[in-house]
């Protein structure tokens, strides 16, 4: 799978994580920080 950094317009897309662009799937993906979940790493869990 080809990946690259997200475009600058997606700055802030991932609330608590790193945004990765999955080129072949034509989609952005959030790699969440520890303790966060959700499509955009918006949920905190204990």
């Amino acid at each position: 799978v080809s990946i690259t950094k997200c475009n600058s317009d997606m700055n802030g897309y991932c609330l608590h994580g790193q945004c990765i662009y999955l080129v072949d799937m034509s989609q952005n993906y959030c790699r969440c920080e520890v303790g966060y979940t959700g499509v955009r790493c918006e949920h905190f869990y204990l």
Partner: antibody, heavy 116, light 106 residues
Amino acid sequence: QDQLVQSGAEVKKPGASVKVSCKASGFNIKDTYIQWVRQAPGQGLEWMGRIDPLRRQTKYREKFEGRVTITADTSTNTAYMELSSLRSEDTAVYYCVRSGTSFDFWGQGTLVTVSS
Amino acid sequence: DIQMTQSPSSLSASVGDRVTITCKASQDIHKYIAWYQQKPGQAPRLLIQYTSTLQPGVPSRFSGSGSGTDYTFTISSLQPEDIATYYCLQYDNLRTFGGGTKVEIK
């Protein structure tokens, strides 16, 4: 399956406002950005602006600043685009477009006609 | 705002010809360019994103290349069903469409 269903065609008088809705099904708009694009008859595609429904953040093309308002109601999974002070040049098909979780999934378009 | 200058605005070619359309950005868009095909009365159809990644179901005669500010879209062998208007779109910093290229058969 994922869908963006837009409101029906509108006819407005110059100086009036129009509000076009875009209802999402099959996905949560909070996971996406919703863009708005328009196309006047026989003309090219023009990006107007977008909203991040989760953060409630908007970005607008400079030429529309002050005349367009993009909003989102996450409880009904619906985005809106309101354009004020309409003029004949605003006659166009208006599209909502999902981006973020996938690349550019388009609604069916809404024709707005501005005529006296 | 980033400007996208697309050329030519129209072209006429024969079936089987190689067709090339270019888009020049006013600044580096880091390969974040897509190409759309639009036929009369229809919504635009995405053909290519991230410069050269073909969407599922799109024929391999369509291709894209480029980097920095200069990008190219190619139809290797024009077919009658390719008659349409083609648009580039930069999506690095917000969004800007090129002015479009109307492709006709000679």
